[in-house]
Interface confidence: low
């Protein structure tokens, strides 16, 4: 049909932190390159109907559906969604194409469905159909990777039974300690499932999909390293595979390695050895101990012995169920306004936890660091000296753990006052919680030293603002003090703060007439 306009339908996917989204539904700012949605003419439909490719959107994602119309003259339009018509404001771009946009902010279930766009141009009328659905991540999984020996080869396969199929990568490092951090230049990544180079210092396998990234480290005993002060411990759940690597370097090949479980040699088929010469002609040997599916009786001390090195052991503990061990009692802290301070939680857990720190309904990323004694620690220092309740939450496949912290900031009270026709109230958020005094200012007491004790009602910690306690004191008005100035003072060990209130006689209370 010659009269049909040339139209283009696009999807603009906005990044999560894109502050430009939604500023104007007519002129959305493009944050990522638009994705063409096709917009083909729908066959066998009454009238001219274009159908865009279906759009799948993650929960909370923000998108813009956009139509570009190459047709002469003006256009008018109307969006219809779930039988409701929505405002539509076309504009023209630099190529003089009509542009119509629909911004969907923070996608939810209620915003899923068919969006119909009716366009009227000088030449013709037509309809464009968009179908928007929520991405079904309902039953996605991301499982921690595990190792298997490759059949008939000295190589490890990394497996992660996840949905959708994850990308698997090996993360290798030949340095010690801190320099093996993810971003370090010493770290090499290989995006493949099979690894043949098994002599490195630090070997991890990671799997990632839409849900994130999970890693498993190849547990290693290095006979050339000084043993840790506490025995290294490895936890596994019944049915999981066990892999321990013993590594030793010697000036020549004249040495051997053996594995023992509780002083009994491992059975044939539960270990394999590899050796190579390093660049300085020393010999590196590695001996793997492995059990394809552990049972309770695989628990015990695994010892790697060498004819040329002191032996070293690791305690392998097989558990029925994962766990998180930590003390969950609440902790209260009191610090000065500029004192450096971090909350910290020390825990032992298997499998590894996912965790968050929360304050005032806002979540903060949670970092965990392994300690030498088998424990891990998570610290939170980003409290910006805001008093209130902080929550640490951790979970793994089998367990959950929550710990509450209260942070109090020592400071002199600040007083806010308000008054009504019948009473005056003062509020303070100082810490320690302040005590109150009320004083009347009069001719007899120009310095406001006359104390008021009648009609005073103190409420300590009467409301929580983001977990922060507020103390208040209320003075009920009596004839004796009407028309006078009164002063409320809050004091604690760090100082005193006062506010003066005029208790007006009957009239347009509490306004003071400005003559």
């Amino acid at each position: 049909n010659q009269d049909l306009p040339v139209i283009k339908c696009v999807l603009i996917n906005h990044k999560n932190n894109d502050s430009s989204v939604g500023k104007s539904s007519s002129y959305p700012m493009v944050s990522e390159s638009p994705e063409d949605l096709g917009c083909a003419l729908r066959p066998q439909s009454s009238g001219t109907v274009y159908e865009a490719a279906a759009v799948e959107v993650d929960v909370s994602a923000s998108i813009t559906l956009q139509v570009l119309v190459d047709a002469p003259g003006n256009i008018s339009c109307l969006w219809v969604f779930k039988h409701s018509s929505l405002n539509c404001q076309p504009h023209f771009d630099l190529q003089n194409r009509g542009v119509v946009s629909m911004v969907i902010l923070k996608m939810t279930e209620t915003q899923a469905g068919e969006y119909l766009l009716f366009i009227q141009s000088e030449a013709t009328n037509y309809t464009i159909l968009f179908t928007v659905s929520i991405r079904n991540t309902l039953l996605y999984t991301l499982r921690r990777p595990y190792f298997r020996k490759m059949e008939n080869q000295d190589a490890l396969v990394c497996i992660s039974e996840s949905v959708p199929e994850p990308i698997v990568e090996w993360v290798l490092c030949d340095s010690q300690g801190e320099s093996c951090k993810e971003e370090s230049p010493a770290v090499v990544k290989k995006e493949e499932k099979v690894l043949h180079e098994l002599f490195g210092t630090d070997i991890r396998c990671c799997a990632r999909n839409e849900l994130g990234r999970e890693c498993t480290r190849l547990f290693t005993i290095d006979l050339n390293q000084t043993p840790q002060t506490t025995l290294p411990q490895l936890f596994l759940k019944v049915g999981e595979p066990l892999w321990i690597r013993c590594k030793a370097v010697h000036v020549n090949h004249g040495f051997g390695l053996t594995w023992e479980l509780e002083n009994k040699a491992l059975e044939e088929g539960n270990y394999f050895e590899m050796s190579t010469y390093s660049t300085n002609r020393t010999m590196i040997r590695i001996l793997f101990a492995f059990v394809s599916s552990v049972a309770r009786n695989d628990t015990g001390y695994y010892t790697c012995s060498s004819s040329k090195h002191p032996s070293q052991s690791a305690l392998v503990t097989i558990v029925e169920k994962g766990f998180i061990n930590a003390t969950n009692s609440s902790e209260d802290y009191e610090i000065d306004q500029y004192e450096e301070f971090c909350f910290s939680v020390r825990f032992k857990a298997y499998p590894q936890i996912r965790c968050t720190w929360t304050f005032s309904r806002k979540s903060f990323p949670c970092e965990q660091k392994g300690l030498d004694n088998g424990y891990s620690i998570s610290k939170f220092c980003n409290h910006k000296h805001q008093p209130g309740e902080y929550i640490f939450h951790a979970e793994n496949d089998d367990a959950q753990f929550t710990k509450m912290f209260t942070l109090n900031i020592r400071r002199k009270p600040q007083v806010l006052a308000e008054a009504s026709a019948s009473q005056a109230s003062c509020f303070s958020d100082g810490y320690p919680l302040p005590s109150w005094t009320w004083k009347k200012c009069s001719d007899k007491s120009p310095n406001c030293t006359e104390e008021i004790t009648e009609g005073v009602w103190n409420r300590k910690a009467n409301r929580k603002v983001f977990g922060q306690w507020v103390s208040s004191s209320t003075l009920n008005m009596s004839e004796a003090i009407k028309g006078f100035l009164v002063k409320c003072c809050a004091y604690n060990s760090l100082g005193t703060s006062c506010e003066t209130i005029l208790l007006n006689s009957p009239g347009p209370f509490p306004f003071i007439q400005d003559n």
Epitope: D58, V59, E109, I134, R135, N136, T137, L138, L139, Y140, T141, L142, R143, V163, E210, L211, G212, D397
Partner: nanobody, 125 residues
Amino acid sequence: EVQLLESGGGLVQPGGSLTLSCAASGRTFSSYAMGWFRQAPGKEREFVAAISWSGSSTYYADSVKGRFTISRDNSKNTLYLQMNSLRAEDTAVYYCAAGGSTRVVVTTTPVVKYWGQGTLVTVSS
């Protein structure tokens, strides 16, 4: 902790129907998204259908759309899968799955939390 127990599997002729049930123990059944997966001999476990905690939203694999219906009865702590127009390729062990303990329909956390033991469905003449 939620325990899941499937029932209703068996031998059925092509074109026939079958209803699978999954009984869940635990008071929190109604707060879980639930689903059915299946695993044919020698194949990977695959997604079949899912339903949100309230039953208001359902999802289906393309291969079963229009033939299978997932539903739930929160008062009975039971999940169902009504299977019509069964084909030989539907032969598999069917597993019931409980998602994350969440009242949202779709979630981006790793959510298959609990699995049933499975029930065998054989479609053959």
